[in-house]
Amino acid sequence: LEIGRFDPERGRGAAPCQAVEIPMCRGIGYNLTRMPNLLGHTSQGEAAAELAEFAPLVQYGCHSHLRFFLCSLYAPMCTDQVSTPIPACRPMCEQARLRCAPIMEQFNFGWPDSLDCARLPTRNDPHALCMEAPENA
């Protein structure tokens, strides 16, 4: 998982920011994303197809910031000041896993390896940018 580093010049190879078009990821506190995302999807359409697999968890309401957390991986925030996508910080991931993994386990499905919290920054700092839980998401 490649975490964005502060880059005032913006890396020459970085794709431009694009408007968030995935319905689940609208109105969560940011409006721009960048592809490919942190899971390797090359378009928002691809990301949306996989993200929809989590709709049952979102509907269960097992974690208040689950939608924001998932979107931070599938449609990560983009800013022109940073050359790579900015994911959620590890504590948000760990809270989501703690509260939502038991729901998946009821159906004999484990927490996905792709959402491994250990790969996320522990906290937001200039060398490993990540997003804290939003106030009103």
Partner: antibody, heavy 124, light 107 residues
């Protein structure tokens, strides 16, 4: 033409293994979540397994969990089902099936393109 | 696991007549229900998704309705090519289930 072409079925003894393949043509497989569905002779349809478009999310019916493994190679536009520890009750026609293309960001829980099916017979 | 029960098991209808097939879910599936047609020796074909939306290329004589636990597939005027087995299917959480099927045969 948009289609799924299957291969790999056949006769296998109980406890044996078999790998089914499903090659996509006319569309880019990496855009779609994919499924395997089976149909025992003279019976109805049974969902078997599902894999997300990147391959990072996989799901199985309880009847095959721990024995079957779904995978995909998007660079080859191909879906696979590895079947181990096969039992007589696994005898069926196996179909690969694509998630419905909603032409947008809303997904519908239906399968719009199906392979032609491949027969798997488990017998001694 | 949500169970889908289709009725009747067999429906005998004359060409040109109306056919009404029922699918009942053991608990609510909202509108997340699809209908398929299957002919002998062939793969299933998607007819209806999201309870009432016709799939691409499906004739207007096929229509779906219902929500929650009660769903209906209606074929307004049966053609010879419509005699087949029809399945309903739903997805709940991460599990898919199909109904046992309704065979529509020539009367």
């Amino acid at each position: 033409e948009v289609q799924l072409v299957q291969s790999g079925g056949g006769l296998v003894q109980p406890g044996g293994s078999l790998r089914l393949s499903c090659a996509a043509s006319g569309f880019n497989l990496r855009r779609y979540n994919m499924n395997w569905v089976r149909q025992a002779p003279g019976k109805g349809l049974e969902w078997v397994s599902r894999i997300s478009n990147s391959g990072s999310l996989v799901y199985y019916a309880d009847s095959v969990k721990g024995r079957f493994t779904i995978s995909r190679d998007n660079s080859k536009n191909t879906l696979y089902l590895q079947m181990n520890s096969l039992r007589a009750e696994d005898t069926a026609v196996y179909y690969c099936a694509r998630d419905a293309d909603s032409s947008g960001y809303y997904r519908y829980d239906a399968f719009d393109i199906w392979g032609q099916g491949t027969m798997v017979t488990v017998s001694s | 696991e949500i169970v889908l029960t289709q009725s009747p098991a067999t429906l005998s209808v004359s060409p040109g007549e109306r056919a009404t097939l029922s699918c009942r879910a053991s608990q609510s599936v909202s509108s997340n229900l699809a209908w398929y047609q299957q002919k002998p020796g062939q793969a299933p074909r998607l007819l209806i998704y999201d309870a009432s939306n016709r799939a691409t290329g499906i004739p207007a004589r096929f229509s779906g309705s219902g929500s929650g636990t009660e769903f209906t597939l209606t074929i307004s005027s049966l053609q010879s090519e419509d005699f087949a087995v029809y399945y309903c299917q739903q997805r709940n959480n991460w599990l898919y289930t199909f109904g046992q099927g309704t065979k529509v045969e020539i009367k």
